[in-house]
């Protein structure tokens, strides 16, 4: 069968729809896709609760599902040839709509490694037990099914549709019926939030009799991130009921005139919006929109706000939270820059020390200065370093090349320096002769 009964839950900037029908994962994804969505993501506990709510709504409408343990496709899949990764929360699976891996998961049991076929995930519902927020549906992975053969216990699927914003449901100040038609082709009379680009048909009156007015509205963006119907004042108002019907459709206060007319009003600290129904806080900072260390600063007339960060921090892309400024990006130091929370510090390379003109400057350390020389004999300072030297008859020695070691000229690389005997001395040598021989004037030969 195709996808039949559906249920809808809209929250935040997304709507979730649940459908019954024995479809393969590919067919289910195609169904969601045709209306501009994808099989649902379950990226957090909160999202799992939204999905559970829409499934509960579906189950209340569905008379009887065939299996006690029913499965509903979600948008988590692993392509053929991609192996299981037990170290990841999603175990190597990924969301069909794309997007990053998320830390939340709720696997039913340990997954078996199999890379030979595509695998798909469904939510496992035990219909013998009530759906409780504390008992969220588990994730079950298995074959993705094929047309006409969806897989065992597959009873339906959940789609997700994302929107740039939502409108509040229309408020009726008298008898009438609102029917919302969403961009994903669902009609409903009861939505907690109505997605952008939805249409609302309002039929005023009680049933067939005295149905006098009808209205048509679209949920549209009236100003940046302000989503509204553009209706002015409560709808379907009736002098017969005044404020007694649904509080006159008013968000907060309803005031009746003597002639049966009425007006909406707001409590102290709130102001009436252009729709003449809804109240909004006079102080947008009262809802603490700024996060982290950001301070909320009211704009003129208290209409909007901006978040401000302490020194060394800047607003992130959301403009609500503070992130550390990486001052090192601007290369403020002559040599090394170390970024720190709210600031930075300059460091000098080995052989240099802080100093010299300008902030963060470094100057050469004179390692050969009096009382500082690391060399046993000669020391020559260089930029950022130094080098040691030795007097004649000595060579540099030691691991760090700072020591001087006597050269044993008697075992020099050029062979014996003396014709006969050779005596090594500190920094030098001298030749000698065997008894009966005399050292020649050249100090090397024996005669």
């Amino acid at each position: 069968t195709g996808a039949d009964t559906e249920a809808v839950v809209c929250v935040g900037t997304a709507c979730y729809t649940a459908h019954s029908g024995k479809l393969s994962a590919a067919e289910a994804q195609n169904h969601c896709n045709q209306n501009g969505g994808n099989l649902a993501t379950v990226k957090s506990k909160e999202e799992a609760q939204h999905v559970q709510r829409v499934l509960a709504q579906l189950l209340r409408r569905e008379a009887a599902l065939t299996a006690r343990m029913s499965k509903f496709w979600i948008g988590l899949q692993r392509e053929k040839g991609k192996c299981l990764d037990p170290s990841l929360p999603l175990k190597g699976f990924s969301w069909v709509g794309g997007g990053e891996d998320t830390p939340y998961s709720n696997w039913h049991k340990e997954l078996r490694n199999s890379c030979i076929s595509k695998r798909c995930v469904s939510l496992l519902l035990d219909l013998s037990q009530p759906l409780l927020p504390s008992r969220l549906p588990k994730w079950s992975e298995g074959p993705c099914g094929s047309p006409g053969s969806p897989g065992s216990n597959i009873e339906g699927f959940v789609c997700k549709f994302s929107f740039k914003g939502m409108c509040r449901p229309l408020a009726l100040g008298g008898p009438g019926q609102v029917t919302y038609t969403t961009p994903f082709q669902t009609t409903s009379s009861s939505l907690e939030a109505v997605p952008f680009a939805s249409a609302a048909n309002v039929a005023c009156g009680e049933g067939d009799k005295d149905e006098t007015q009808s209205h048509y509205f679209l949920c549209k963006e009236k100003a940046p991130d302000v989503f509204d119907w553009g209706s002015s004042g409560p709808l379907c108002v009736s002098p017969k009921y005044g404020c007694n019907f649904n509080n006159g459709g008013c968000h907060q206060d309803c005031f009746e005139g003597g002639d049966g007319s009425f007006l909406c009003g707001c409590r102290p600290g709130f102001r009436l919006l252009d729709d003449l129904v809804t109240c909004a806080s006079r102080n947008p900072c009262s809802s603490s929109p700024c996060r982290g260390g950001a301070t909320c600063v009211l704009g003129p007339h208290g209409k909007n706000y901006t978040c401000r960060c302490p020194q060394g921090y800047q607003l992130d892309s959301s403009q609500l939270d503070c992130v550390d400024v990486d001052e090192c990006q601007d290369s403020p130091c002559a040599q090394e820059c170390v970024n720190t929370p709210g600031g930075f510090r300059c460091e000098c390379w080995v052989g240099y020390e802080p100093g010299g003109p300008g902030e963060g400057a470094c100057q050469d350390v004179d390692e050969c200065a009096l009382g500082r020389s690391p060399c046993a004999q000669g020391c020559t300072n260089t930029d950022g370093s130094f080098h040691c030297s030795c007097e004649e008859g000595y060579v540099l020695a030691g691991e760090d090349g700072t020591q001087c070691q006597d050269v044993d000229e008697c075992v020099g690389p050029g062979g014996p320096l003396c014709d006969s005997l050779c005596f090594n001395t500190q920094g030098s040598f001298h030749c000698g002769c065997l008894p009966g021989w005399v050292l020649a004037p050249n100090g090397v030969s024996c005669t």
Epitope: L218, K220, P224, D225, G299, L315, S318, Q319
Partner: antibody
Framework: QVQLVQSGPEVKKPGESLKISCKAS????????LNWVRQMPGKGLEWMGR????????DYNGKFKGQVTISADKSSGTAYLQLSSLKASDTAVYFC???????????WGQGTLVTVSS | DIVMTQTPLSLPVTPGEPASISCRFS???????????LYWYLQKPGQSPQLLIY???NLASGVPDRFSGSGSGTDFTLKISRVEAEDVGVYYC?????????FGGGTKLEIK
Amino acid sequence: QVQLVQSGPEVKKPGESLKISCKASGYAFSSYWLNWVRQMPGKGLEWMGRIYPGDGDTDYNGKFKGQVTISADKSSGTAYLQLSSLKASDTAVYFCVRGDGYWAMDYWGQGTLVTVSS
Amino acid sequence: DIVMTQTPLSLPVTPGEPASISCRFSQSLLHSNGITYLYWYLQKPGQSPQLLIYTMSNLASGVPDRFSGSGSGTDFTLKISRVEAEDVGVYYCAQNLELPWTFGGGTKLEIK
């Protein structure tokens, strides 16, 4: 391509009324705000109001409320600006302008010059 | 209403030289969504205005990259790196954060 074609220049007497048209083509007329902007001779730009043709929702600049009416006909893709009880100070060029998804006024009509003179 | 002050009123520039126009608003145009709803338009002599920059710094389609927009929540600048003869006209800044939408008074750029 997107085009906004406005009706021709008008010469009116004080106290009369006038309806300027703006024919849109090349985009989904019902799904974008259509604004009206006034430019008095040698002066700057003033936003008068707008309409969302999809459901006829309108917003007006308080300065022009009561003096102008904005309407639209979805079937023909045409927006209208009606000016009532014309005065000499209503002499201006009136532009119709599409508002895009970033709230920019991205496509402008060629303008309609209205001259009010006795 | 959001009020804006645009400076200078008139700007004579030599071709090939840079130019800069400023716009200051009575309140921040930075929305909590991180977008700044500030726009720049150019009205060439005898023509309808045309969009140059949207949301503070984004170049509209077909606009040469010698134009650039920058600024903070209330202070904004339109820069032309090298002015060309075809750039003459009146430049307007505008805000679309809050109804009624409002325009700056305009800056007339002319060639020296």
